[in-house]
């Protein structure tokens, strides 16, 4: 009888250790998500929808660090480009640093050469300030080099290694950006 109780106690202790391990793993996962909240949602979405897909970017997208980029093969006006990206679960490119700008311009040189590509930058009609599509301001080094003479709405685009501005209703290629999915392995 005592041996039976002892065995049960050992089994319960083993279960408790396993649960503690699981809790520790979960706590660690939670902490890493809190540290990288920005990418955590994308990671969870990946786990939900494509548990076996280990690729951080979809087919035909280019990866750099935590981002995936899609260079369009069609022309459209800025607003339609914005919608096209959204349909694919992305937004027009938002350039956060010179390093990212260099990567983009370098990639474009390899892919297509010197064309115009809409990015998610547009000028506020009232203040004339440049803003990214989420409402944030670009860093001083990432402002379009020339002010468009257009009386219409003005949007930003990349050409060669420069950020320029143009009437939003002109037709250009465009670049979409989404967060790269982190491997669940």
């Amino acid at each position: 009888k005592l041996l039976q109780v002892s065995t049960i106690a050992m089994q319960q202790q083993e279960k408790l250790i396993q649960q503690e391990r699981a809790l520790l793993n979960f706590t660690e996962w939670k902490r890493s998500c809190a540290l990288q909240m920005k990418y955590c949602q994308a990671f969870m979405q990946n786990s939900l929808s494509s548990a076996h897909n280990s690729s951080p970017c979809p087919n035909n997208w280019i990866q750099n660090r935590e981002s995936c980029y899609y260079v369009s093969e069609i022309w459209s006006i800025w607003h339609t480009s914005q919608e096209n990206c959204l349909k694919e679960g992305s937004t027009l490119l938002q350039i956060e640093s010179k390093e990212e700008m260099d990567f983009i311009t370098g990639s474009l040189r390899k892919i297509k050469g010197s064309y115009d590509y809409w990015v998610g930058l547009s000028q506020d009609g009232h203040s004339g300030r440049w803003l990214w599509q989420d409402g944030s301001s670009p860093s001083p080094g990432l402002l379009p080099a020339e002010r468009s003479q257009s009386a219409n709405q003005v949007c930003g685009y990349v050409k060669s290694n420069s950020l320029l501005s143009s009437n939003c209703s002109t037709w250009k290629y465009f670049i979409c950006e989404k967060y790269a999915l982190r491997s669940s392995v």
């Epitope: 920005k38 949602q41 979405q45 959204l86 967060y179």
Partner: nanobody, 116 residues
Amino acid sequence: QVQLQESGGGLVQAGGSLRLSCAASVNIGTLNSMAWYREAPGKQRELVAGITGGGQITYANSVRGRFTVSRDIAKSTAYLQMNTLKPEDTAVYYCAAYDRSATPYWGQGTQVTVSS
């Protein structure tokens, strides 16, 4: 098949606020994105704001700084908080969802009227 139901529209004075909700029949965390569009009489339907599966946000230039898009994955609901409303914001507001194959699904729409 994704079903979407908007609510929260109504009549408001210029300068006022409204909050639109869009309840989805699926887990919105599995969608490519959700978006709000609007259609004013005699005008084309236009994108107002959108939020991607990864949480990226985009706004139309005309509403940036006044409108805020958000979502609650647990409730499978997207929201559009509209502040400092103007008469030109008067329109039928539609919620849209794009699934993994970029197929669009639309709600029935909710009327927003801003009086001066």
